[in-house]
């Protein structure tokens, strides 16, 4: 099409743009390491960083771990996408009593309406079943017929929901006299260590949350308690701790009540790109410990790559590659220790501190 020629010409000589014949227009060329968010990007904002699998690009342009839905009571609602976390919700037959960022900190089974009550609104992943009296105008929970009134929207009797494991409290599903009062959980027998991640214990105004200890009279020294594998973030929200379940990660610090689990690359590897509380990309430590490894025939011409060897294996690497750079693999149990007097290199475990002294000790 001759009329397209001027548009194509405008792209020539401009290294930041290229001409896309399919859409017949100039497109912005994303810089190395960034990927287009659409077929023909027009500006730098149409390019994005690419995160590792199971990570997404958050609002601050950081690669952040997607939440996991691995708990038995959760299912995946939306998958982990390039710009949004995986979203988990309670599995069918349960509802969320304590929400968390992109997930649910505590799921309860939907209530079963007791005798004399029928389902007004079925339970969803977010809400419990709502029950109403079977015959309008008469509530089976009335103390006597003369005290009965039409239940208002906020006072529909509802069975006490049952929490799923790991919260092991039992619950009564029968309404008690008084119409709107719910049966109390038989939780008084249950105890909890002060910093245990379990959230059962003394009844709390907010399901799924409990104070660290019984609050002293007139004291505000109580805190929200999140479910296992969640922590209380700075904004006071229960947030999923990152997962270290990738093969190349190990746990550095555990998930605590007020801080996320942190992950690091397993021994013998190094973090090439970080992520919040974790490492988005681990690579084998690329420089071999000197004089401790052999040079196999098939690695003489290999360039450095970022592919990790299978777990439990670390191929030999070339301590003096032809290209002047280090190969990708290393022995995880070797570290560089320089003895300036003897010019020796001694193998030591990775976990041991590297002390460099003139005596080599």
């Amino acid at each position: 099409f001759p009329q397209d020629r001027p548009f194509e010409d405008t792209c020539h000589g401009n290294p930041s743009h290229y001409y896309d014949k399919a859409v017949r227009r100039c497109c912005y060329r994303c810089p190395m390491g960034l990927f287009p968010t659409q077929q023909c990007p027009q500006r730098p904002t149409d390019c994005r960083k690419q995160c590792e699998p199971d990570y997404y690009l958050d609002e601050a342009d950081r690669c952040t771990a997607c939440v996991t839905c691995s708990r038995d009571d959760l299912v995946e609602k939306t998958p982990c996408a390039w710009n949004s976390s995986r979203v988990c919700e309670c599995r069918p037959g349960m509802f969320c009593s304590t929400s968390a960022v992109n997930s649910c900190a505590r799921c309860f089974f939907h209530s079963v309406c007791p005798a004399g009550m029928i389902v007004k609104f079925p339970g969803t992943a977010q809400k419990n079943t709502v029950c109403e009296p079977a015959s309008p105008g008469v509530s089976p929970a009335c103390a006597s017929p003369e005290n009965c009134k039409e239940p208002s929207s906020g006072t529909i009797p509802q069975a006490k929901p049952t929490p799923v494991s790991p919260a092991t409290s039992s619950a009564s599903t029968m309404p008690v006299r008084g119409g709107t009062r719910l049966a109390q959980e038989a939780a008084s027998k249950l105890t909890r260590a002060p910093d245990s991640p379990s959230s059962v214990g003394r009844p709390s105004s907010d399901p799924g949350l409990s104070p660290t200890q019984p609050c002293p009279e007139g004291s505000g020294d109580c805190r929200k308690q999140c479910e296992p594998d969640y922590y209380l973030d700075e904004a006071g929200r229960c947030t999923a701790c990152v997962s270290c379940s990738r093969d190349d990660l190990v746990e550095k610090t555990p998930c605590a009540w007020n801080s996320s689990r942190t992950c690091e690359c397993r021994p013998g590897m190094i973090c090439a790109t970080s992520a919040t509380n974790s490492c988005a990309r681990c690579v084998p430590y690329p420089i071999c410990a000197a004089e401790t490894v052999t040079k196999p025939q098939d690695m003489a011409e290999k360039d450095t790559t970022f592919e990790a060897p299978p777990l439990g294996t670390q191929p030999d690497c070339n301590p003096t590659p032809e290209n002047g750079e280090a190969p990708a693999s290393t022995s995880p149990t070797q570290s560089l220790l320089v003895d300036s007097q003897a010019s020796k290199t001694l193998p030591i475990p990775t976990s041991a501190p590297v002390a460099l002294s003139s005596t080599g000790k």
């Epitope: 690091e264 973090c271 430590y285 750079e325 280090a326 560089l336 460099l356």
Partner: nanobody, 122 residues
Framework: EVQLVESGGGLVQPGGSLRLSCAAS????????MAWYRQAPGKGCELVSI???????YYTDSVKGRFTISRDNAKNTLYLQMNSLRPEDTAVYYC????????????????WGQGTTVTVSS
């Protein structure tokens, strides 16, 4: 205690060059492996290059052929010569000691020194 001071950053046009330095103290003798990491605004901490105590080097793919890492053990100084700079090299650059041990987690930016800012822009 290990202390690192990075310097040499600045504003440079695409295609230009800079030489970063990292003055180290607290090491004995030749010191351990050393690394350069960088962190672009709002992004993660990224490995750039490593040099071993005996001078063997490693570079991440995006800087190969453009950056050169070196060290002067007598002066306890680490260097990063950056040529053919690109806008995507814009970041705060940090040096890190003994990356084999210290850089397994995503925390090798800003733990030892304040870093030096490199801005590549026309």
């Amino acid at each position: 205690e290990v202390q690192l001071v990075e310097s040499g950053g600045g504003l440079v046009q695409p295609g230009g060059s800079l030489r970063l330095s990292c003055a180290a103290s607290g090491f004995t003798d030749d010191g351990p492996d050393m690394a350069w990491y960088r962190q672009a605004p709002g992004k993660g901490c990224e490995l750039v290059s490593i040099i071993s105590a005996d001078g063997r080097t490693y570079y991440t793919d995006s800087v190969k052929g453009r950056f050169t890492i070196s060290r002067d053990n007598a002066k306890n100084t680490l260097y990063l010569q950056m040529n053919s700079l690109r806008p995507e090299d814009t970041a705060v650059y940090y040096c890190a000691p003994d990356p084999r041990r210290n850089c397994r987690g995503g925390d090798c930016c800003g733990n030892w020194g304040q870093g030096t800012t490199v801005t590549v822009s026309s």
